[in-house]
Interface confidence: low
């Protein structure tokens, strides 16, 4: 019925699914048959497939709808041509003529859009002992309107990082610590400079690689160790060591030794495996009192770190396998017998 629907001006943020134009064609063939049914196709001016045409089969009305977001930056003006045709082929010798084609001009107006990050999540990996001021990563975003972007960090709860507002480079500004939690997650904000100051948010994940910075220690509280006095035979006890470093490919391999030479007459320590060792008495002639045995534990790391731990061992007279003391004689009675 109409071959030129003129200009249609829309904002680039017009909702997907919106009907933007109604078109009407007529067919002289018998109603409600394949011969009179009309289908509409956009044949020119929409290579991105942003538009589509739905047809009402009862009225042959066509509804031009938005299928994909419009974009001022890539297509501000589009000359759209569509064709009305029957689903059944025309009889031999009959051709579609100019009245079967129509057009309209789609003018898209600019809407200020937020900057767009090149990734949803940016990841970087550094050793936890990097020098303060080291560049640990960078992020990039672009503004659809070409405005300058200012970067900032959000959620840097440990105060470890700084971002260069212009380049998006991220630097360490404090000592990093893998044991405090890795990866360390912060948000990166890209904000337009000027305009309406729209912003977008992405994630920056800093994976901290472990360095050997935690000395070995006892895996648990070993207070309350005791032997029944007098010893009838040399005794022993087992203890476990640990540290807070990451052991990715194998468990820790600690070595154990007595922490002072003077202990060697009374005690010996022998390794059971990488984490456990046995402390044994060398004789049975111990006084009825508490002995504090110092153990040196080396983690064999790079650099090797050493911890000196103390195991308090009490020799006490026992009743039915438990330490016995007259009331008031000793507080903190040990509870673990050997």
């Amino acid at each position: 019925e109409k071959s030129d629907y003129g200009n249609l001006t829309l904002a680039e943020d017009t909702n997907i699914g919106s009907t933007i134009l109604t078109i009407q064609a007529t067919d002289a063939d018998e109603p409600f048959t394949g011969s009179s049914k009309i289908l509409y196709h956009i044949i020119k001016g929409d290579s991105e497939g942003r538009l589509g045409v739905d047809t009402d089969p009862h009225t042959n009305t066509g509804y031009v709808i938005i299928k994909k977001p419009l974009d001022f930056e890539t297509a501000a003006v589009s000359n759209i041509v569509f064709k009305a045709e029957n689903p059944e082929p025309l009889v031999f010798g009959v051709k579609y003529n100019a009245s079967s084609f129509a057009k309209f001009t789609l003018i898209v107006t600019d809407v200020n859009e937020a900057p767009q990050f090149s990734q949803h999540v940016f990841q970087a990996k550094v050793s936890e002992d990097v020098a303060i001021g080291t560049k640990v990563g960078n992020v990039t975003a672009k503004d659809p309107e070409g405005l300058d972007i200012s970067y900032s960090l959000r959620g840097d709860t440990r105060g470890w990082l700084k971002i260069d507002h212009v380049t998006g480079e991220i630097f360490s500004v404090a000592p990093l610590d893998r044991e405090a939690g890795s990866p360390y997650r912060v948000q990166v904000v890209a904000t337009e400079v000027g305009g309406s100051s729209l912003s977008s948010v992405s994630e920056f994940h800093l994976i901290l690689m472990d360095v050997n910075d935690n000395p070995p220690r006892l895996a648990k509280d070993y207070t309350g160790l005791f032997f029944c006095h007098p010893l009838s035979a040399p005794g022993s006890l087992i203890f476990e060591a640990t540290d807070d470093d990451q052991h990715l490919f194998r468990g820790p391999h600690f070595t154990f030794s007595l922490g002072s030479g003077s202990l060697q007459n009374d005690w010996e320590v022998s390794k059971i495996n990488g984490t456990h060792a046995r402390l044994s008495t060398r004789h049975t002639e111990f006084e009825e009192r508490e002995y504090v045995v110092l153990i040196r534990i080396n983690d064999g790391g790079r650099p090797p770190l050493e911890g000196i731990v103390s195991l308090p061992v009490t020799f006490c007279s026992c009743v039915e396998g438990s330490c016995f003391r007259p009331a008031g004689h000793q507080t903190g009675i040990p509870t673990v017998g050997m």
Partner: antibody, heavy 118, light 107 residues
């Protein structure tokens, strides 16, 4: 030699805005990693960190005072400024500026005394 | 906020003494602790950073130790110029916070 010197009004009245200036020498606030903080100390009491400005103009504030504080800098004149709005007698204190580098306040100014009194 | 507590507000010691000033944090601070000295005239100086590192120009009689939440500053051989108030300060989390101070006096 790094030095910092604070200056302020000395005395002002409640509800007024306190403006402080920190003038420094021996370093540049355009150097990566540099920053200057403001710290205050009410008479006979402990130290309270107020605000910090980084070399790239990024800022950090103590949340308990954030709504009243504005820190800024003039890199070319080697100065850092602090404004505190709506002052009260509780804001009477000695105000220090200090250079913060590598997570430490390694050099401090001598402080400037501020009294809020009606 | 992380609270820094110096339980001893004042301390009296004799010249030559070994003095230890303690400081505790309300939560673990990963050794992110500095110590400052404030002289009676108000002058403030950095002594120790990162728990145990001696700042340049500070006499070796000052030392720091600790981990987790409990830290201490030790002066091994007290001298007259050490009369001051000593503050610990954490930088594990913002806001940066100081202890209440320990005033050191001569007996």
């Amino acid at each position: 030699q790094v030095t910092l010197k604070e200056s302020g009004p000395g005395i002002l009245q409640p509800s007024q805005t306190l403006s402080l200036t920190c003038s420094f020498s021996g370093f540049s606030l355009s150097t990566s990693g540099m920053g200057v903080s403001w710290i205050r100390q009410p008479s006979g009491k402990g130290l309270e960190w107020l605000a910090h400005i980084f070399w790239d103009d990024d800022k950090r504030y103590n949340p308990s005072l954030k709504s009243r504080l504005t820190i800024s800098k003039d890199t070319s004149r080697n100065q850092v400024f602090l404004k505190i709005t709506s002052v009260d007698t509780a804001d009477s204190a000695t105000y220090y500026c200090a250079r913060r580098v590598l997570s430490t306040f390694d050099v401090w100014g001598a402080g400037t005394s501020v009294t809020v009194s009606s | 906020d992380i609270q820094m507590t110096q339980t001893t507000s004042s301390l009296s010691a004799s010249l030559g003494d070994r003095v230890t000033i303690s400081c505790s944090a309300s939560q673990g601070i990963n050794n992110y602790l500095n110590w400052y000295q404030q002289k009676p005239d108000g002058t403030v100086k950095l002594l120790i950073y990162y728990t145990s590192s001696l700042h340049s120009g500070v006499p070796s009689r000052f030392s720091g130790s600790g981990s987790g939440t409990d830290f201490s500053l030790t002066i091994s051989n007290l001298e007259p110029e050490d009369i001051a108030t000593y503050y610990c300060q954490q930088y594990s989390k913002l806001p940066l916070t100081f202890g209440g101070g320990t005033k050191l006096e001569i007996k």
